[in-house]
């Protein structure tokens, strides 16, 4: 669920998601449209696709709560719980490390970016 994602992103990136990423650019945070603004925004667009796929698989992406371990900078999604819980953890792990990989190109001006400015083709999944 969303609590898992927030905690994981904070642990991996060191940033407070609600201040740094939700929202950011055209795809970080709820919803998403248009061309991603930078590499960080692409992370979120890919994550949206990951969630969309799980939704088509009948998973409750905002409700399902999963277990994971964070140690020495790495995330280990446990092999406990349902298929949906495990896959949800994998989606969130991927976005967390994607955001971390792109910290060096993070742009403060894209925080709280005005969504009507998000133009162009929304990338397909």
């Amino acid at each position: 669920g969303i609590l898992n994602l927030n905690k994981m992103v904070k642990q991996v990136t060191g940033k407070m998601p609600i201040l740094s990423y939700w929202p950011y650019g055209c795809h970080c945070g709820l919803g998403g449209r248009g061309q991603p603004k930078d590499a960080t925004d692409w992370c979120c667009q890919t994550h949206d696709c990951c969630y969309d796929h799980l939704k088509t698989q009948g998973c409750s992406i905002y409700k399902d709560y999963y277990r994971y371990n964070f140690s020495q900078g790495n995330i280990h999604c446990s092999d406990k719980g349902s298929w949906c819980e495990q896959q949800l953890c994998a989606c969130d792990k991927e976005v967390a490390f994607c955001l971390k990989r792109n910290l060096d190109t993070y742009q403060k001006r894209l925080r709280f970016y005005w969504r009507p400015h998000c133009r162009g083709q929304t990338p397909g999944c």
Epitope: T56, G58, S82, C84
Partner: antibody, heavy 119, light 106 residues
Framework: QVTLKESGPGILQSSQTLSLTCSFS??????????VSWIRQPSGKGLEWLAH???????RYNPSLKSRLTISKDTSRNQVFLKITSVDTADTATYYC???????????WGQGTLVTVSA | QIVLTQSPAIMSASPGEKVTISCSAS?????MYWYQQKPGSSPKPWIY???NLASGVPARFSGSGSGTSYSLTISSMEAEDAATYYC?????????FGAGTKLELK
């Protein structure tokens, strides 16, 4: 060789607490990914999953019965326990324990123990 | 929770006949698992991850399906196949079973 065996009181009165024990051999509940579930089956009816405990003491419960269930384990004695509070006649069933390891199903089952709740 | 509906509830088949038991999920699941149970015995693991036969299961059994529709098939019914078959999912919590299909020998 993996074996599981359930034991229980056999008969108990309505409103009492049911205590069940699953004794197993052939595997260790300290192994990563390992877990044991309790599943019940009223006579002539289908299977109902009740609760699951993992190697690291993480516990999962069936939401419809969660308030009445407590699962626990004694890793050193190779035992898993289930308590069901405030039983009534609807809890009359054969209770099974079953092993789940890193997949989404039960590859090993106990023989079951019949529990009868009298009014 | 995901509800698994098995059909038919009861059926009978003659030796040599092809048998298909269906399991319909209330929403899409990734895998289906099947158990066989005979009177007075505990359930036996039968088919895992939709189509893989558990150890010792005869090759006349097969499993298939995707999404919300799954099935267990016996290519040629034998007397020892008379039993109740249950489907099970753990795609999402809680883990659930179907109500069972009782297969009788005609």
């Amino acid at each position: 060789q993996v074996t599981l065996k359930e034991s229980g009181p056999g008969i108990l009165q309505s409103s009492q607490t049911l205590s069940l024990t699953c004794s197993f051999s052939g595997f260790s509940l300290s192994t990563s990914g390992m877990g044991v579930s309790w599943i019940r089956q009223p006579s002539g009816k289908g299977l109902e999953w009740l609760a699951h405990i993992y190697w690291d003491d993480d516990k999962r419960y069936n939401p419809s019965l969660k308030s009445r269930l407590t699962i626990s384990k004694d890793t050193s004695r190779n035992q898993v326990f289930l308590k069901i509070t405030s039983v009534d006649t609807a809890d009359t069933a054969t209770y099974y324990c079953a092993r789940k390891h890193s997949d989404y199903w039960f590859a090993y089952w106990g023989q079951g123990t019949l529990v009868t709740v009298s009014a | 929770q995901i509800v698994l509906t098995q059909s038919p509830a009861i059926m009978s088949a003659s030796p040599g006949e092809k048998v298909t038991i269906s399991c319909s999920a209330s929403s899409s699941v990734s895998y289906m698992y099947w158990y066989q149970q005979k009177p007075g015995s505990s359930p036996k693991p039968w088919i895992y991850r939709t189509s893989n036969l558990a150890s010792g299961v005869p090759a006349r059994f097969s499993g298939s399906g995707s999404g919300t529709s799954y099935s267990l098939t016996i290519s040629s019914m034998e007397a020892e196949d008379a039993a109740t078959y249950y489907c099970q999912q753990y795609h999402s919590s809680p883990l659930t079973f179907g109500a069972g299909t009782k297969l009788e020998l005609k």
